[in-house]
């Protein structure tokens, strides 16, 4: 049974060339959170965070990726085409796979701003 | 290349007990969950155990917690799968699988061992 | 328990026909459906995962979709090495479950 859900940053945005946090937080289980992937919209994927081995940064993303906070991603140096979805999937036992839903918009703008409220896509 | 080997499969009275294994070549071992999935003579597939890549964390479905433990040693890249109390139902093809190391599917299987269970 | 029921269980086409195999979960499972190939004397083959995504290695007249509870592998332009039996397998939450099997015959 999957009673848990998954709160994120929703949609942010940030200044092209700054940084920006990915955060998504699992709550309402008690499930045993063994594996969190970071995504992009068209699949391919970030980092991994495993519970055991720890952080996995794929090497495409070496460069510009940061494992953490916690569970989330920093993703560093944006350009225009770091604009899209991001999507946080926790693994977990015995529940299974949840997945949250951020929407990045880079901005060129300097009055850009980084919007950190939670909420539940 | 990835390969996974089963072994120890064979005719087992109903009530006992056999301890298969699966020798993992090709990859890094430790950085892998790996799940067992048999087979019935009906051709149906039955997700039986899983275990996180350093053995801490291990999962197995209702039909067969108590009777089947899922276990590895990183040292010689092999998986266990213990099973007491079979039944006849238990007769199968089993079959190792290393899941993709985002945990999406199970990305490679072995040629599977084949157990009986019948008196 | 997530029920997937799979169709057809038998299915007979030529070579260079497109075809189809569903399968659909007693509830949703989000995106998280695998498509697996088995044939006699080879290892079971992963064709797509996450519903749609293609596993590196696998050509292209593979594809998948759906989401939800309802899914659709497709093979276009079939080849002699396609026929084989087909299973699906829902990812998204435990115990794993999956479809009953398609076996794709030559016609």
């Known amino acids: 049974m999957m009673t848990g859900t998954i709160e994120t940053t929703g949609n942010i945005s940030a200044k092209k060339g700054g940084s920006v946090i990915l955060q998504c937080h699992l709550s309402s289980t008690m499930a045993q959170v063994t594996q969190v992937n970071w995504e992009q919209h068209d699949h391919s994927l970030l980092a991994i965070r495993n519970a055991e081995l720890g952080w996995h940064i794929y090497p495409a993303f070496k460069d510009r990726v940061a494992p953490g906070p916690g569970l989330g991603l920093t993703l560093q140096s944006l350009t225009m085409n770091d604009t899209g979805e991001y999507f946080c999937t926790y693994h977990t036992y015995p529940d299974g796979t949840y997945r949250g839903r951020i929407f990045l918009e880079v901005l060129e703008s300097s009055v850009a701003e980084h919007s950190a409220r939670f909420q539940i896509p | 290349e990835v390969q996974l080997v089963e072994s120890g499969g064979g005719l087992v009275k109903p009530g006992g007990s056999l301890k298969l294994s699966c020798a993992a070549s090709?990859?890094?071992?430790?950085?892998?969950?790996m799940s067992w999935v048999r087979q019935s003579p009906e051709k149906r597939l039955e997700w039986v155990a899983e275990?996180?890549?350093?053995?801490?964390?291990?999962y197995h479905p209702d039909t067969v917690t108590g009777r089947f433990t899922i276990s590895r040693d990183n040292a010689k890249n092999t998986l266990y799968l213990e099973m007491s109390s079979l039944r006849s139902e238990d007769t199968a093809m089993y079959y190792c699988?290393?899941?993709?190391?985002?945990?999406?599917?199970?990305?490679?299987w072995g040629q599977g061992t084949s157990v009986t269970v019948s008196s | 328990d997530v029920q997937i029921t799979q169709s057809p269980s038998y299915l007979a086409a030529s070579p260079g026909e497109t075809i189809t195999i569903n399968c659909r979960a007693s509830?949703?499972?989000?995106?998280?459906l695998a498509w697996y190939q088995e044939k006699p004397g080879k290892t079971n083959k992963l064709l797509i995962y996450?519903?749609?995504t293609l596993q590196s290695g696998i050509p292209s007249r593979f594809s998948g979709s759906g989401s939800g509870t309802d899914f659709t592998l497709t093979i276009s332009s079939l080849e002699p090495e396609d026929f084989a039996m087909y299973y699906c397998q829902q990812h998204n939450e435990y115990p794993w479950t999956f479809g009953g099997g398609t076996k794709l015959e030559i016609k």
């Open positions: 996450s519903g749609s």
């Open positions: 699988a290393r899941k993709r190391r985002d945990y999406y599917a199970m990305d490679y």
């Open positions: 275990i996180s890549g350093g053995g801490s964390y291990t």
């Open positions: 509830k949703s499972i989000s995106k998280y």
């Open positions: 090709g990859f890094t071992f430790s950085n892998y969950a």
